[in-house]
């Protein structure tokens, strides 16, 4: 047989016996000659053992590059592969020789009395017991002990090969202390040497330190570090610790095996390092290393040793946090300290408790920040041992992107009569206030949606070309007033007004407000009509349960077919910066209403009456008139707001007060409600009557008592009443000092 690949084109060495396997009897002479094309060498079984004195390799007498190997009186142990090869190459010819010795059918091991087989306890692994045979076709079984068990080749996973040995799955013999091969020849049993079975695992799955990180102590405290190694079965483990101060008096190391569940494929080992009283020199890196027969695994942790307990804020602790409404705000308490401090958060001096909107821990988290979260937050760190306290104030500023108040009134805004002067407003609330409010415009016909056009939810108007109001060519003459600042609903707002000198063309106007955190915009539909005109009788804003009439007046010579409609729910949701479809072009959303027609000399008047107006009656009312000549429809829209009935309330308290005789008392009583309540004053439950000294002003809101006298002392009541009931507040006025005697007395 030949092995290897030629490095250069040489013929294989040629053997005198042209066979792969040769079988000879013990005590005979083995002689093989090898011829080749360059220097040759022989390799034979155990060719480095003491047997080499019996082996003779000689140069052939009849030619160059020829060597003969001779072994007189061969024994079973000479069984094996004989190889003739060219020096420095892999080119070789091999013959396997069996020296049949029926008295010792197994080739004896080079080692003395016994061998060792390492096995891994694994269902998939096999082990080879190297009991080679000097006879190729023996019946060999494997004996394992104790208890005694015999394994016979099964033609599958258990087999014997004279050149290799006995192959068997590892787990079958993992219980055994020793194994040997046995052959039966003519009812006679022959045994190989004994092999000691060593079950060896080496795999370390992981090495875990506990605590794993952030270990802090102060001088004198005890350090306990646990190191756990998880391994496969049958692993022998050595632990080693590396630590800063190697010469430690109070260091203690304990290693032990941990119990694992029966049937577990894993073993656990624990090494515990204890230092009773740490010193500053014990600060540093602690490394635990676990070593097995074929693996070393390590893990490290840093131990910090402080001189004494302390607490301080870290350099990264913020003093100002800026956020935008709706964001999640995280303010971490960055500290240095040992042991970890107790952390308490306060807002404007009031302790904060965690709930679904706020989490007050190591990190103060506000889930969705709102304006009311603006303020000063104080974090107080307390060292649990020394009770030392440190505090730090963080100012939270919540920014609000511009919000335009009028945007909440989403409606196809009223139509405007041709030639009138109109004012459009944008009331902007933003923190910080907007750095600019700009107005833009565009002609309505450039932007209006034809019924044939597809309306997209996000952009129902293809309004692309917004023009600056400075450029009002082709549009209405415009003047932008200087921004005003007003306190509305307790908030500082910026009001921007746009004055249209004469409403000549229908257009769209857009105000855009920008501040550092965002922008807001409002689009106003400014529809100019020469057509009908809507008026409300008796009032612009009725209160529920009051009656109201909507009058639509149109020139009879120009218009016909006056009809009242109410605008139904929007077919599409209205998004930021969008407008509803112009109503005259989309009658599908209108509900026809019953109305009464009146005429005078020039006009037709269509009156739609709402008796006992309710909140449901709010909305947009459309009066549609048709041009007699062109048949073109003209629409006028009026938004009707019905005010909710609200029982009277009095804002602010009347304060008890003490006044000296001769001084004046001024008090006010502000009431709200719908319908507006009537205010009345009482003194000692009697109606207060105005005279020269008692003055009631501003619909009785303000009471003034001039040059008070002793008899003005008493219980004063302010009462606000409407059809929905009354509200009252009381105060006691004390008058001090002696009354001067008059001449009459």
């Amino acid at each position: 047989a030949s092995v290897g690949l030629p490095s250069v084109s040489l013929d294989l060495p040629r053997l005198s016996i042209q066979k792969d396997i040769l079988t000879i009897k013990a005590n005979t002479t083995l002689q093989i000659t090898c011829r080749g094309q360059r220097d040759l060498d022989w390799l034979w079984p155990n060719n480095q053992s003491g047997s080499e004195q019996r082996v003779e390799v000689t140069e052939c007498s009849d030619g160059l590059f020829c060597k003969t190997l001779t072994i007189p009186k061969v024994i079973g142990n000479d069984t094996g592969a004989y190889k003739c090869f060219y020096r420095e190459t892999d080119l070789a010819s091999v013959i396997y020789v069996y020296v049949q010795d029926y008295r010792s059918p197994f080739i004896a091991s080079v080692s003395d009395q016994h061998g060792v087989v390492y096995i891994t306890e694994n269902k998939n692994k096999t082990v080879v017991i190297p009991c080679l045979g000097s006879i190729s076709n023996l019946n060999v079984s494997l004996c394992a002990r104790y208890p005694e068990k015999r394994f016979v080749p099964d033609g599958n996973r258990i087999s014997w090969d004279s050149k290799k040995g006995f192959t068997i799955p590892s787990y079958m013999i993992s219980y055994a202390g020793m194994v040997f091969c046995e052959a039966k020849i003519n009812d006679e049993s022959y045994q190989s040497i004994m092999y000691i079975v060593v079950v060896v695992g080496y795999r370390i799955y992981d090495v875990v330190l506990s605590p794993s990180h952030g270990i802090e102590l102060s001088v004198g405290e005890k350090l306990v570090l646990n190191c756990t190694a998880r391994t496969e079965l049958n692993v022998g483990i050595d632990f080693n610790w590396e630590y800063p101060s190697s010469k430690h008096q109070h260091k203690k190391l304990v290693n032990r095996d941990l119990k694992t569940q029966s049937g577990s494929e894993m073993k656990k080992f624990l090494s515990t390092l204890t230092i009773d009283g740490v010193t500053r020199s014990d600060q540093g890196l602690y490394t635990c290393a676990a070593s097995s027969g074929l693996m070393t695994k390590k893990n490290s942790t840093f131990v910090r040793v402080h001189e004494k307990p302390f607490v301080a804020f870290g350099s990264g602790m913020e003093s100002l946090v800026e956020a935008t409404v709706g964001e999640r705000v995280r303010i971490p308490a960055k500290y240095l300290g040992y042991p970890p401090p107790e952390i308490k958060w306060y807002k404007n001096g009031i302790p904060l408790e965690s709930n679904h909107t706020i989490k007050a821990g190591h990190v103060l988290t506000i889930m969705e920040v709102s304006e009311r979260d603006t303020g000063n937050y104080t974090v107080i760190l307390t060292n649990p041992i020394s009770k030392e306290k440190q505090s730090h104030v963080v100012s939270l500023v919540v920014y609000v992107p511009p919000q335009i108040g009028e945007k909440s009134l989403i409606s196809p805004v009223d139509s405007y009569q041709y030639g009138t002067t109109q004012t459009l407003t944008c009331t902007v609330y933003a923190i910080p206030p907007p750095h600019h409010i700009h107005w833009y415009w565009q002609l309505e016909e450039e932007c209006a949606n034809e019924p044939s056009q597809a309306v997209s939810v996000t952009n129902p108007y293809p309004c692309e070309e917004w023009r600056s109001v400075e450029d009002f060519q082709g549009g209405n003459k415009i003047e932008v007033n200087k921004n005003q600042f007003a306190l509305i609903e307790g908030k500082n707002k910026t009001v921007s007004t746009l004055v249209i000198q004469a409403a000549n063309v229908s257009a769209l106007y857009k105000c855009e407000a920008v501040n550092k955190v965002g922008r807001g915009e409002r689009v106003i539909s400014f529809h100019v009509t020469r057509g009908p005109e809507i008026t409300l009788q008796p009032d612009m804003q009725p209160t529920e349960q009051e009656s109201v009439s909507l009058w639509c007046t149109a020139d009879r010579s120009t218009f016909e077919n006056l009809t009242w409609y109410k605008l139904g729910p929007q077919p599409l949701p209205i998004h930021v910066g969008e407008l509803p479809t112009p109503v005259c072009k989309n009658l599908d959303t209108l509900w026809k209403l019953n109305a009464t027609m009146f005429s005078n000399s020039t006009n037709d008047i269509l009156i739609m009456e709402l008796k006992n107006a309710s909140l449901q009656d709010q909305g947009d009312y459309v009066c549609l008139a048709q041009d007699r000549k062109t048949k073109k429809r003209h629409c006028v829209v009026r938004q009707l707001t019905v005010l909710e009935r609200v029982a009277p309330t009095i804002t602010g308290n009347l304060e008890n007060q003490t006044t000296s005789i001769g001084e004046s008392i001024e008090v006010s009583c502000t009431a709200s409600g719908n319908p507006p309540p009537q205010i009345m004053w009482f003194k000692d439950n009697e109606t207060l009557v105005e005279d020269s000294g008692i003055v009631l002003k501003d619909g009785n809101r303000n009471l003034t008592i001039r040059r008070v006298r002793k008899e003005d002392e008493g219980l004063y009541t302010c009462q606000a009443c409407s059809v929905l009931g009354c509200a009252k507040v009381e105060a006691f006025f004390i008058i001090e000092g002696a009354q001067e005697k008059t001449n009459l007395e």
């Epitope: 692994k125 632990f239 070593s291 097995s292």
Partner: antibody, heavy 117, light 107 residues
Framework: EVQLVESGGGLVQPGGSLRLSCAAS????????MSWVRQAPGKGLEWVAT????????YYVDSVKGRFTISRDNAKNTLYLQMNSLRAEDTAVYYC??????????WGQGTLVTVSS | DIQMTQSPSSLSASVGDRVTITCRAS??????LNWLQQKPGKAIKRLIY???SLDSGVPKRFSGSRSGSDYTLTISSLQPEDFATYYC?????????FGQGTKVEIK
Amino acid sequence: EVQLVESGGGLVQPGGSLRLSCAASGFTFSSYGMSWVRQAPGKGLEWVATITSGGSYTYYVDSVKGRFTISRDNAKNTLYLQMNSLRAEDTAVYYCVRIGEDALDYWGQGTLVTVSS
Amino acid sequence: DIQMTQSPSSLSASVGDRVTITCRASQDIAGSLNWLQQKPGKAIKRLIYATSSLDSGVPKRFSGSRSGSDYTLTISSLQPEDFATYYCLQYGSFPPTFGQGTKVEIK
């Protein structure tokens, strides 16, 4: 830098004894298992013996068991291989090798042991 | 013991050639295989561990892969300093065993 320097090799007669040493530096010797691997002239590599970091466990190839002893002195950062009853087939270059997370990771230059009469 | 059959035992190649060396494991070693490089008079150096992970400082032209029980070392573009003998080492089962080695020579 990990360094392993073997010494103690030489010529010895069959049946004789020899003690190989391996001086380790550049790493925490006491944390690592160590091995000896040999290479007969012109042949491949063969694992000989292993010792765990603390010396608690030792393992040997079958052919040297009972004749060779692996040991270590962690205080001196030195690994040893005591070889007794030497045979001609023990002739080889003996390498000192560190056992890392994935078996044998760092090797020494080797020391030659020749067993011959 | 697990037998590692390494092939070829030697090969001749030129600088720039792509070279592959294979080791076949007689049993499953679950990817626990290293590749070593031996140059005359120098310490043996580990190139690859755990089938395919490169040791630090080893050029990226060396790579390792696995297909079943066959493990391959590939040198994508042979360099003059790569002429050496390469060994595979299995550590999937104790004891560790080596391949017979592959000598890479200059053509």
